[in-house]
């Protein structure tokens, strides 16, 4: 069965947009006007995961690219990466755990918790033009809250 997906962009709670920084990295920075076209469009797929009444499991692919955000251990630390997949097989309902994020909505803001590494979240830095990363703290310096903007297919 085709997995249900929607196209969207994400901005952190400081209104920084997410853009590509090289082939396998995202960075967050403030964009205005025509520069907004640089922001990445995600294909958010609704997948199987440890769903709860507060958490919806999703996979975050880059629209029309065979790249998905995934969480892996690098040097013993949970790390966010962009991983290339076979477009014939993705997206799928039963995504591998490293691709799955728990989408959590709190006060109209979204958090994306790694299913592979509970309590680690997609995060951005306060500083401009820094990589999007997987962070293990909430409510500190780093930003874990996002808003989602729907994009027509």
């Amino acid at each position: 069965a085709p997995v249900r997906s929607l196209n969207c962009t994400l901005r952190d709670s400081q209104q920084k947009s997410l853009v590509m920084s090289g082939p396998y990295e995202l960075k967050a920075l403030h964009l205005q006007g025509q520069d907004m076209e640089q922001q990445v469009v995600f294909s958010m797929s609704f997948v199987q995961g440890e769903e709860s009444n507060d958490k919806i499991p999703v996979a975050l692919g880059l629209k029309e690219k065979n790249l998905y955000l995934s969480c892996v251990l690098k040097d013993d630390k949970p790390t966010l990466q962009l991983e290339s997949v076979d477009p014939k097989n993705y997206p799928k309902k039963k995504m591998e755990k490293r691709f799955v994020f728990n989408k959590i909505e709190i006060n109209n803001k979204l958090e994306f918790e790694s299913a592979q590494f509970p309590n680690w979240y997609i995060s951005t830095s306060q500083a401009e033009n820094m990589p999007v990363f997987l962070g293990g703290t909430k409510g500190g310096q780093d930003i874990t809250d996002f808003t989602m903007q729907f994009v027509s297919s």
Partner: antibody, heavy 122, light 107 residues
Framework: EVQLQESGPGLVKPSETLSLTCTVS????????VSWIRQPPGKGLEWIGL???????YYNSPLKSRLTISKDTSKSQVSLKLSSVTAADTAVYYC????????????????WGQGTLVTVSS | DIQMTQSPSSLSASVGDRVTITCQTS??????MNWYQQKPGKAPKLLIS???TLRPGVPSRFSGSGSGTDFTFTISSLQPEDFATYYC?????????FGQGTKLEIK
């Protein structure tokens, strides 16, 4: 060997809270989810909700406002509380282990307890 | 929620008969279909998962097939111990939903 055993009072008064415990052995509640299912006398099966290994819960909509599922991992116990019960909540209540096979069979249930009959009556 | 339509609701058959039960889902669930056997006063027992995978220790006369929205459960040659109620369960999406059950009785 995987085993689940439900326990709790067999009789609950209307408007009170139904409380049941599921004691498990042969697997860890940190690694596997546990579902609750009920079956009114002579009727079919209704899935109530579950608690995952990490402690998150999913409650089926019809019962959501009255339902609490929690666990004590150290005691290998999962509990169900259903408030404001009526005669319609009279049923055999089962707990069951989730298969938890990521990317294969995450939501299926393989082992069940023997069930416990709860009657709601004054 | 995914709706389940299981049929027939009851069935009379004899030892040695071939019996088929069907389950239809309101949404495509790939192969996330399970079949359970329940005897009076007992808990349901998982016979088949993922539409066609026989659980260890379950006799080979039980089989399952189908994918998408249409599923079939078959007992190739009924034995006296097979008279029970059978339920389908979709495990594709939460909330999990059961079929209404099929009571298999001796003719």
């Amino acid at each position: 060997e995987v085993q689940l055993q439900e326990s709790g009072p067999g009789l609950v008064k209307p408007s009170e809270t139904l409380s049941l415990t599921c004691t498990v052995s042969g697997f860890s509640l940190m690694d596997y989810g546990v579902s609750w299912i009920r079956q009114p006398p002579g009727k079919g099966l209704e899935w109530i909700g579950l608690i995952w290994g990490g402690g998150d819960t999913y409650y089926n909509s019809p019962l959501k406002s009255r339902l609490t599922i929690s666990k004590d991992t150290s005691k290998s116990q999962v509990s169900l509380k259903l408030s404001s019960v009526t005669a319609a909540d009279t049923a055999v209540y089962y707990c069951a282990k989730q298969r938890n096979l990521w990317g294969y069979d995450l939501y299926g249930m393989d082992y069940w307890g023997q069930g416990t009959l709860v009657t709601v009556s004054s | 929620d995914i709706q389940m339509t299981q049929s027939p609701s009851s069935l009379s058959a004899s030892v040695g008969d071939r019996v088929t039960i069907t389950c239809q889902t309101s949404t495509d669930i790939d192969d996330d279909m399970n079949w359970y056997q329940q005897k009076p006063g007992k808990a349901p027992k998982l016979l088949i998962s993922l539409a066609s995978t026989l659980r260890p220790g379950v006799p080979s006369r039980f089989s399952g097939s189908g994918s998408g929205t249409d599923f079939t459960f078959t007992i190739s040659s009924l034995q006296p111990e097979d008279f029970a109620t059978y339920y389908c369960l979709q495990s594709s999406w939460l909330p999990l939903t059961f079929g209404q059950g099929t009571k298999l009785e001796i003719k």
